[in-house]
């Protein structure tokens, strides 16, 4: 049994880190493999993660961690029974992938404006709460070429767009993702998308 692509890990900088890797051939990850992880300091407790399959040769493990802080560094050991397949280390604060924003809502009650709001995925006590910026993807359900990205570089999780910039009588979808500038993170996953119908009509005199 051999590791084809070594584990790479990302942290939500709260309590979960996710490691992914590829094996040399088809593997029942949960039955055959274990990923052991231990905080590098004195004789900290060793934790075990049972991986799941992620495609035929891919494995993924979700490591539960007690309140990740900047000082934490973990050793990682990938075992197949008594055989050590790979040994590495992982510092969560240097490999941050933010949680995805949630509760994306579209407000169309103001006739000429579409207001999108969403929730910050972090509690206010987490440093990332005030460090996130967002990208909002809006697309036409009937024409995937009609798609745009709005970068939200201010802290408030809202975006206002003139309804006139969207085609009238068309259903649109939106989704949002986040990244943290001070930590130079990767982008989060996209939030679930939400749908609305753009019923905006230009005032008669502008037609």
């Amino acid at each position: 049994m051999k590791v084809l692509q070594e584990p790479t890990c990302v942290s939500d900088y709260m309590s979960i880190s996710t490691c992914e890797w590829k094996m040399g051939g088809p593997t029942n990850c949960s039955a055959e493999l274990r990923l052991l992880y231990q905080l590098v300091f004195q004789s900290s407790e060793t934790h075990t993660c049972v991986p799941e399959n992620n495609g035929g040769v891919g494995c993924v493990c979700h490591l539960l961690m007690d309140d990740v802080v900047s000082m934490d560094n973990y050793t990682l050991d990938l075992w197949a029974g008594q055989q050590l397949l790979w040994k590495g280390s992982f510092k969560p604060s240097e490999h941050v992938k933010p949680r995805a924003p949630g509760n994306l809502t579209v407000h169309t009650n103001v006739s000429d404006t579409v207001l999108l709001t969403w929730s910050n995925p972090y509690p206010p006590d987490n440093y990332l709460y005030n460090d996130l910026t967002y990208a909002v993807n809006i697309w036409n359900e009937n024409d995937l070429a009609d798609s745009r990205i709005h970068n939200v570089t201010y802290l408030k999780p809202t975006l206002r767009i003139p309804a006139s910039t969207l085609k009238s009588g068309i259903s649109y979808r939106a989704r949002v993702r986040a990244w943290a500038q001070h930590y130079n993170t990767t982008w989060s996953e996209w939030s679930p998308s939400t749908k609305w119908y753009n019923s905006y009509r230009e005032p008669f005199e502008q037609r």
Epitope: Y13, M14, S15, L39, V40, F41, S44, E45, D66, D67, V68, V69, S70, M71, D72, N73, S93, E94, P123, D125, N126, Y127, L128, H182
Partner: antibody, heavy 121, light 107 residues
Framework: QVQLQESGGGLVQPGGSLRLSCAAS????????LTWVRQAPGKGLEWVST????????LYADSVKDRFTISRDNAKNTLYLLMNSLKPEDTAVYYC??????????????WGQGTTVTVSS | DIQMTQSPSSLSASLGDRVTITCQAS??????LAWYQQKPGQAPKLLIY???RLQTGVPSRFSGSGSGTSFTLTISGLETEDLATYYC?????????FGQGTKLEIK
């Protein structure tokens, strides 16, 4: 506003024990790691121990490991430091401290006023 | 353990002076460095975190810079209330380690 108030210091003989307490208010106690820092007379600051918020992971300086035990009671909003087998070199002012953010445990934005521990025969 | 070396260990400066205190880490700590001020008989107070971020309520004459192994705390115009001892602290890896302190006196 955040308040931290240490108590439990005093004079103790070498080999003796003390339990320090730190009563906290003004923040969601259970969300933050908490830290003890000490300062010997006329000396600099020394990190002693940290306890994480939810899983209760505990970390200690080598100088106190196996003698000191940090703990917390989230229901009482109180942090503790049980000090056993005390030595003269443990004589210091002991501060409890809270970080600015739950994941930046070393950026200690709030401190108590300290409690004095004297180990002497 | 990461060693933090502060210099100078003490310094005397005049009111209005620009004062610089440096902190050297024994290995790279990225920007995980904080600066604390401790006045006689008081608890320490956080001035700067993340190497350069000013803590809320701290006067803008204080600034921090540096990353990797070399860091600087600068007081741009010294005031009487700045009489204190200053400490750096690395929070890059366990154990947390402080510099030995810099005692700032007013001439």
């Amino acid at each position: 506003q955040v308040q931290l108030q240490e108590s439990g210091g005093g004079l103790v003989q070498p080999g003796g024990s003390l339990r320090l307490s730190c009563a906290a208010s003004g923040f969601t106690f259970s969300s933050y790691s908490l830290t003890w820092v000490r300062q010997a007379p006329g000396k600099g600051l020394e990190w002693v121990s940290t306890i994480k918020a939810r899983g209760g992971t505990t970390l200690y300086a080598d100088s106190v490991k196996d003698r000191f035990t940090i703990s917390r009671d989230n229901a009482k909003n109180t942090l503790y430091l049980l000090m056993n087998s005390l030595k003269p070199e443990d004589t210091a002012v002991y501060y409890c401290a809270k970080p600015l953010y739950s994941n930046l445990a070393g950026d200690l934005g709030s401190w108590g006023q300290g409690t004095t521990v004297t180990v002497s025969s | 353990d990461i060693q933090m070396t502060q210099s100078p260990s003490s310094l005397s400066a005049s009111l209005g002076d620009r004062v610089t205190i440096t902190c050297q880490a024994s290995q790279s700590i990225s920007s995980y460095l904080a600066w604390y001020q401790q006045k006689p008989g008081q608890a320490p107070k956080l001035l700067i975190y993340g190497g350069s971020r000013l803590q809320t309520g701290v006067p803008s004459r204080f600034s921090g810079s540096g990353s990797g192994t070399s860091f600087t705390l600068t007081i741009s115009g010294l005031e009487t209330e700045d009489l204190a001892t200053y400490y750096c602290l690395q929070d890059y890896s366990w154990p947390l380690t402080f510099g030995q302190g810099t005692k700032l006196e007013i001439k």
